[in-house]
Each structure stands twice: as C-alpha cells, then as structure tokens.
Interface confidence: medium
C-alpha cells in the first residue's frame, strides 16, 4: 500500500495473507468459514511451493493470539483466467478446515448486486504489499482509502487505454495506491467486498495508471458454485 498508514490492529478480521513457503505473497479475503478469495495470478508466483493462508494477523512476524496459519485443501482459479491478461483474475482457496471465528477472524460479506460502485465513493484497501517504490515491505497491515474512478476515465488512452472491462473497476492512484504484494486483497466499500486487487505488473502511485480491481459482483454465480 503506497501513501497509506498502519491499519488498526485486527479491525479488518476478514484480511488474509496468502503465503508460499512461509512468506507473504498476496492478500486475500475470508468470504466464508472455509474459503478465502484472492487473485488467480498469485498462484503463478507460487510455483511448486507450499501455499498457506494466514488469518487473524496484524503483524506478519510477531506472535499474536488470534493468528493462525491454515493449509490449503484446494485452489480454484477462475476457469477463464490466463497468465497474459488480468481478466477473470480471481482465485478461491479452500482451507484445510473451517477457520475459528472470533473478533479478529470473520468473513466479509461480498457484493452480489451487479451494479457499478458510484464514482467518488471512498473504499478501503488493505494489505502487506510494498510501501515504497524502493520495495520496502511492511510487517504490519497497511490500509488506504481510495475514491472509485469512473470506467470511462480509467479507459482513456492516457490511462488504461480500453483495457478495463465491465467486470473490473478502478480506483484513483495519485500517490495513494495498492501495489505489489497487495494483489488478491479486498477493496471494501460500505462494509461490503466490492473488488479484489488485480495482480498485474502495473506501476503504482501514478495517477495516470489507476488501480484495477476485479468486481466480485460480476462473478457471483462462479463464487456461489465453488462455495456450494
């Protein structure tokens, strides 16, 4: 997260760290007791490493009573996701067992009504991604509030040049932005999960390159079918 600040500890009980061989790789969001939603591209970076999900964390390194690392029983990328595009960049991870819920570990309701979030709406994005262009990684969860950007502006030739589909949404990126390591994390608007940070190699913090998020409402049928 660029231009953000440290999050209130455990105030986002849905927040997950998707880890490979014990290292943070991507963000994720607990959407049901045994399921975490993340970005499909995260799996590409996992290679053959052991994928696990950390829940109930604020600090990645420090012991915390609510922290627990879960093995992954099943990884389900969206069937249409491809390495060369950010389309359908969603991944569902089934935990080895149901998460133990409490104040610091709780699923987040996700948007099922397929309607664009109003431009200008402030949404919360959080993650353990880099906090500087030099690549500094935080130990504690960071967050930032970002205004939603209308799709027409986001698709301008000077911005993303038509790449933003109806199944994506954009947020402003003027010095405040999601970045590398935040992919798969939640964009929360009004207490509801609206978007998942896409995992492209986009430049961060440049207002001409807005943040791109996969709209979960557009994938409600797929999410429901996997969770069923």
């Amino acid at each position: 997260i660029l231009g953000g600040r440290e999050a209130e500890a455990h105030a986002r009980p849905y927040m997950a760290s998707v880890q490979v061989n014990g290292e943070h790789l991507c963000g994720g969001v607990l959407v049901a007791e045994q399921w975490v939603l993340s970005a499909a591209h995260c799996l590409e970076d996992a290679a053959d490493g052991k994928v696990q999900v950390l829940l109930g964390a604020h600090s990645l390194s420090q012991p915390e009573p609510s922290k627990r690392l879960y093995d992954v029983l099943r990884a389900v990328p969206h069937p249409d996701s491809r390495p060369d595009t950010i389309d359908h960049d969603l991944l569902l991870l089934q935990l080895s067992e149901k998460a133990t819920l409490g104040p610091a570990v709780r699923p987040l309701p996700w948007q099922r009504v397929d309607r664009d979030v109003e431009p200008g709406t402030l949404c919360d994005v959080a993650g353990w991604g880099i906090v500087s262009h030099a690549g500094r990684r935080p130990d504690r969860l960071q967050h930032v509030l970002l205004p939603v950007l209308d799709r027409a502006t986001c698709n301008r030739r000077t911005h993303h040049d038509g790449a933003i589909t109806q199944r994506m949404m954009c947020a402003e990126s003027n010095r405040r932005d999601s970045c590398k390591g935040d992919s798969g994390g939640p964009l929360v608007c009004g207490g509801v999960l609206e978007g998942v940070v896409t995992s492209g190699s986009r430049v961060c913090g440049n207002r001409k390159k807005p943040g791109i998020y996969t709209r979960v409402a557009s994938y409600a049928a797929w999410i429901d079918s996997v969770l069923a």
């Epitope: 999050a7 209130e8 455990h10 105030a11 986002r12 009980p13 049901a32 007791e33 819920l101 409490g102 104040p103 610091a104 709780r106 699923p107 309701p109 109003e118 200008g120 709406t121 402030l122 919360d124 967050h143 509030l145 205004p147 929360v188 608007c189 009004g190 207490g191 509801v192």
Partner: antibody, heavy 121, light 107 residues
Framework: QVQLQQSGPELVKPGASVKISCKAS????????INWVKQRPGQGLEWIGW????????YYNEKFKGKATLTVDKSSSTAYMLLSSLTSEDSAVYFC??????????????WGQGTSVTVSS | DIQMTQSPASLSVSVGETVTITCRAS??????LAWYQQKQGKSPQLLVY???NLADGVPSRFSGSGSGTQYSLKINSLQSEDFGNYYC?????????FGGGTKLEMR
C-alpha cells in the same frame, strides 16, 4: 464524549416533506457512518440506510428508496434525512446512530435521542 | 434480504431469574450480530457486538453466544433495571435488519 443531537418533534401534513437533523460531536464526523432507523409507535426498529460523511456515499434499504434522502454537511458535522410525500405510515420516531467504518465494532454504538414525526391533517 | 426472527416476542419474569432471548438469521451471518436494550421512550443502547463481546459499561450478567444462524442473549439474575425491549441486528451486508424485538416485563 460522543453525542448525536437530533432536531425537535415535527407535525406535518400528508403529502408534505420534512427534514430532520442530527448534529454529531465528540468524535471525527467523517470517519463513521451515520445510520437512520425508524420506529413506529409500539413497534420494532427498521433500518433506513446509512451515509458515510467522508465521501457522501449512501446506501438505502430498498423499502425506503424514494422516501428518504440522506445528506451531510461536513462543516457543521450534521447529518440530515429528508422524508418526502408523507403519509400516516411515516408517523414514527426516527433515530440517527453511529457505526464504525473500519472498526471491528460492527454495531451501532451511539444513538441520537430520536425525532418524533407526526403526519396529520 | 436477511430476515432476523427473534423469540420470544414477550417474556414475563421476576427479578433474580435468568432469561434467554434468541435470534435466528435466515442465512449464516458469521457472528456479525449486535444486541440492544431499549427502555420506554428512550434510544436503544448497545449491549453486545460481534455476537459475544460486551459493550463498554454493560454489566457482566449479560452475555451473548451463538454462531452461524443461531444467536442468544442471556441475562443472569435479572435486575429491575433490565426490564424493557431487546433487539438483535445483523451486520452481514446491507440492509442491516433488526429482529422483531422481545418485550421483557415484570411478572
């Protein structure tokens, strides 16, 4: 300390509109939702919707779309609810109430004292 | 929309007794539930948040429990100031509906 001070009782005619206010103090107004809740005499509570003063974003219970309009004035830390095309069904006490934005206290922790609206010819 | 079914609708009890009020959600709300007390002519007051956590200043005779779709509020050794109306409310996506309420009256 946190306070939500609502405007006084209103007696209005059917078909008219009324705007009730809720002045917040003792906390950062732009960091919390303001919810509005309806309670008819002797009845339970109905959630009308919320507004996030930081952005002006609103969300309405479908039942109250077109009936209630939520706004804020950040400069005076005041939230407003406009009720339009009033009928006797709108006679009720209306509460404003605060919810955390990114706290894990997913609950209404402070309430206004309520504003009574009576619709009568 | 999620429906919250609260029971019983009313309860007639004496000081010192223990009472339990229940709330059933029409789908799993993952502990995103609050309980409120409302006295006649007053605003509701928060008692419990996230199903089991007591709000500041709430006496320890109150306790919340439950998970999934079933939740309860228990009041041990009822005091005279505990009589009034009780409501549950879910926070699992909007609209944040309330239960129908339970009226706790003195026998």
């Amino acid at each position: 300390q946190v306070q939500l001070q609502q405007s006084g009782p209103e007696l209005v005619k059917p078909g008219a509109s009324v705007k009730i206010s809720c002045k917040a103090s003792g906390y950062s107004f732009t960091d919390y939702y303001i919810n509005w809740v309806k309670q008819r005499p002797g009845q339970g509570l109905e959630w009308i919707g919320w507004i996030f003063p930081g952005s002006g974003s609103t969300y309405y219970n479908e039942k109250f779309k077109g009936k209630a309009t939520l706004t804020v004035d950040k400069s005076s830390s005041t939230a407003y609810m406009l009720l339009s095309s009033l009928t006797s069904e709108d006679s009720a006490v209306y509460f404003c109430a605060r919810t955390g934005y990114y706290s894990n206290l997913y609950a209404v922790d402070y309430w206004g004292q309520g504003t009574s609206v009576t619709v009568s010819s | 929309d999620i429906q919250m079914t609260q029971s019983p609708a009313s309860l007639s009890v004496s000081v010192g007794e223990t009472v339990t009020i229940t709330c059933r959600a029409s789908e799993n709300i993952y502990s995103n539930l609050a309980w409120y007390q409302q006295k006649q002519g007053k605003s509701p007051q928060l008692l419990v948040y996230v199903a089991t956590n007591l709000a500041d200043g709430v006496p320890s005779r109150f306790s919340g429990s439950g998970s999934g779709t079933q939740y309860s509020l228990k009041i041990n050794s009822l005091q005279s100031e505990d009589f009034g109306n009780y409501y549950c409310q879910h926070f699992w996506g909007t609209p944040y509906t309330f239960g129908g309420g339970t009226k706790l009256e003195m026998r």
